[in-house]
Interface confidence: low
């Protein structure tokens, strides 16, 4: 008799793929544009990335550091009207893209939470949650919560409002903290909160360090669903050298949880390469004309257009990983087991019941390495086969689809491998 199938977990929409943050509409659209109507025209691009949700804004009225002139129920006219927002929501819904609205109050000011008037601001947020839920948004984000006094209790209250409206609504909180204890204390009183932080921001040094950070986090958070990013708002290039971008894309898409990216992460957008552009929100490079300030500063391979036409680009890798993440059960909600593979390497298995299984091996170092996969670290339910098929490598030149002997696995510098193998009873 065939073994009984394991019962599928309840999956919310944010469990099924990546979230894409557009914190600055003007920078995202460029060319002096930057409104909701223009963003609607970019939804097809978001669809091509296979992302499940768009984290938008803030777009509300906010006069820098002035509580009285901050209205979370009003859209800043520079971004458009309520009608434009409704139209964006409708179009996004048709394309199965959820819209999460950032309500960080004083986003133009010094302290995101107007440190002296916490209660006034908290009431404004509460009213705004109810208002925008009625308008049809799918969730909310609030950032810089380390600047919010009594953050845990406010988050619990806002979570109740959000979930009370529908279990299908999401609340995301962001913090600049990278301290695990602080992160855990925020999560403690908020069961379904998705928290973005700087926890992984200094993980780039070695495979062992990254492995330790990831496993500590997963062990500490237990069965709760988590998110993976390197910060609450900034680009991957703020933390990583170019040669590690592919490796991190592979890792973020294959860890158990929701990967969260900022606009431009998919093309390796780097403010440092664009003189005069702000680090936190450089202009999105749609094509070579997106940054006219310095002729020749932008080459085709830095842009969406150029990378779309190059199937070997970072953007193509992002699309491919996003596609795998959204359709493979083992990556959607599979178990996770990290195990030793040798110095400099981080490797893990994702598996769900009798579905196809995935092995990820990441070489964070700048030298080629032989992987010594220690299968003895793994439980019987997640044993390794002798061979696995190469689904993709972050480095070109490997014969994809071909079986690789796991005992003889060699990785190039900064190479990540995604291998698949069938369930064996």
């Amino acid at each position: 008799r065939a073994p009984r199938c394991r019962e599928l977990p309840a999956q919310k929409w944010w469990h099924t793929g990546a979230l894409y943050r557009i914190g600055d509409l003007q920078a995202f659209q460029g060319h002096g544009a930057g409104n909701l109507a223009g963003l609607k025209g970019r939804l097809d691009y978001l669809s091509s990335l296979k992302v499940k949700g768009l984290v938008l804004g803030p777009i509300h009225k906010n006069q820098k550091d002035d509580v009285a002139q901050t209205d979370l129920l009003q859209i800043d006219p520079n971004f458009g009207s309520k009608e434009d927002f409704d139209s964006l929501l409708q179009s996004a819904k048709k394309k199965s893209i959820r819209v999460i609205l950032d309500l960080t109050p004083n986003y133009r000011g010094e302290n995101s939470w107007f440190s002296t008037q916490v209660d006034t601001v908290a009431t404004k947020v509460k009213d705004a949650l109810e208002f925008w839920l009625q308008a049809g948004v799918d969730g909310f984000q609030v950032r810089d919560i380390e600047n919010l006094k009594d953050a845990s209790s406010f988050l619990a209250e806002w979570q109740n409002i959000t979930k009370g409206f529908s279990e299908d609504r999401l609340l995301i909180a962001g913090t600049n903290s990278s301290d695990l204890q602080q992160i855990l204390s925020l999560l403690e009183s908020n069961k379904d909160l998705l928290l973005t932080s700087s926890y992984l921001s200094d993980s780039g040094s070695t495979g062992e360090h990254t492995k330790s950070l990831v496993t500590q986090y997963l062990n500490a958070t237990g069965n709760r669903w988590c998110s993976w990013s390197l910060s609450q708002a900034r680009l991957l290039t703020s933390f990583l050298p170019a040669q590690l971008l592919r490796l991190y894309q592979l890792m973020l898409f294959t860890l158990p949880g929701t990967p969260v990216f900022s606009y431009g992460d998919e093309i390796g957008l780097d403010a440092a390469a664009l003189p005069g552009q702000p680090m936190e929100a450089p202009v999105m490079l749609w094509d070579e004309s997106s940054f006219p300030d310095i002729p020749g500063a932008v080459s085709a391979n830095m842009t969406v257009k150029g990378q779309s036409e190059d199937p070997g680009s970072l953007l193509s890798l992002f699309r491919r990983l996003s596609d795998q993440r959204s359709k493979e059960r083992s990556l959607l909600h599979g178990d996770f087991h990290a195990f030793s593979a040798g110095p400099g390497l981080f490797s893990y298995i994702r598996h769900w019941d009798q579905n196809e299984r995935f092995l990820v091996v990441l070489n964070f170092g700048d030298v080629g390495l032989s992987a010594g996969l220690q299968a003895s670290d793994l439980p019987a339910s997640a044993s390794l086969p002798a061979k696995a098929d190469l689904l993709l490598s972050t480095q070109p030149g490997r014969e994809e689809g071909s079986p690789l002997e796991l005992e003889r696995l060699k990785l190039e510098p900064h190479e990540g491998l995604l291998l698949r193998f069938p369930y064996a009873a």
Partner: antibody, heavy 123, light 112 residues
């Protein structure tokens, strides 16, 4: 072993249309990016079109965009090239080709070619 | 578009000789991911082209070790250490670093 067999070539008048087919066997067709490459009477080789493994993405040189459409049927293991507004300079032997590997479709060398099908555009 | 220039146009050789074909590109073929996508093909009379070398210097399966590729940036060379009768035909270099992919005009290897 990998086999690619083109068909559908022939004589066509300038401005006319033609649809080429390529039947693939001996490998998992849906796993690979596929290509059309042509060879002119002067024996010059020219890349014509690329299609992604699932068929969602197509790439063309600028002088063929809008006139040529590459498509595929992963159930029947067939690759197609629809050509319209044909010109005399489109006269060539048209080959379908498969890559050596399929890392995001970047060409690591066209490892497998069909025997070709001849397209002649002439009044 | 990247222009690929091959020389010589024709290369008469005696069997057993070494042959060398040059290929020059109008722009560097070093891709941003660190690879150089320069390939070599051989087309024998009445046949379709066959892949010999991929990514500058990697022999495709079944290609004899008398064929070797070298070069970087914009200058590349294909060498045949001891020419055999079955090596005769037209050799093409090709680049796929930049879209559109382009080919050289070909070098005809023939018996002296």
């Amino acid at each position: 072993q990998v086999q690619l067999q083109e068909s559908g070539g022939g004589l066509v008048k300038p401005g006319g249309s033609l649809k080429l087919s390529c039947a693939a066997s001996g490998f998992t067709f849906s796993d690979y990016y596929m290509y059309w490459v042509r060879q002119t009477p002067e024996k010059r080789l020219e890349w014509v079109a690329t299609i992604s493994d699932g068929g969602s993405y197509a790439y063309y040189p600028d002088n063929m965009k809008g006139r040529f459409t590459i498509s595929r049927d992963n159930v029947r293991n067939n690759l197609y090239l629809q050509m319209s507004s044909l010109k005399s300079e489109d006269t060539a032997m048209y080959y379908c080709a498969r890559d050596r590997a399929y890392y995001y479709g970047s060409s690591y060398g066209f490892a497998y070619w069909g025997q070709g099908t001849l397209v002649t555009v002439s009044a | 578009d990247i222009v690929m220039t091959q020389s010589p146009l024709s290369l008469p050789v005696s069997l057993g000789d070494q042959a060398s074909i040059s290929c020059r590109s109008s722009q560097s073929l070093l891709h941003s991911n660190g690879n150089t996508f320069l390939h070599w093909y051989l087309q024998k009379p009445g046949q379709s082209p066959k892949l010999l070398i991929y990514k500058v210097s990697n022999r495709f399966s079944g290609v004899p070790d008398r064929f070797s590729g070298s070069g970087s940036g914009t200058d590349f060379t294909l060498k045949i250490s001891r020419v055999e009768a079955e090596d005769l035909g037209v050799y093409f270099c090709s680049q796929s670093t930049h879209v559109p992919y382009t080919f050289g005009g070909g070098t005809k290897l023939e018996i002296k």
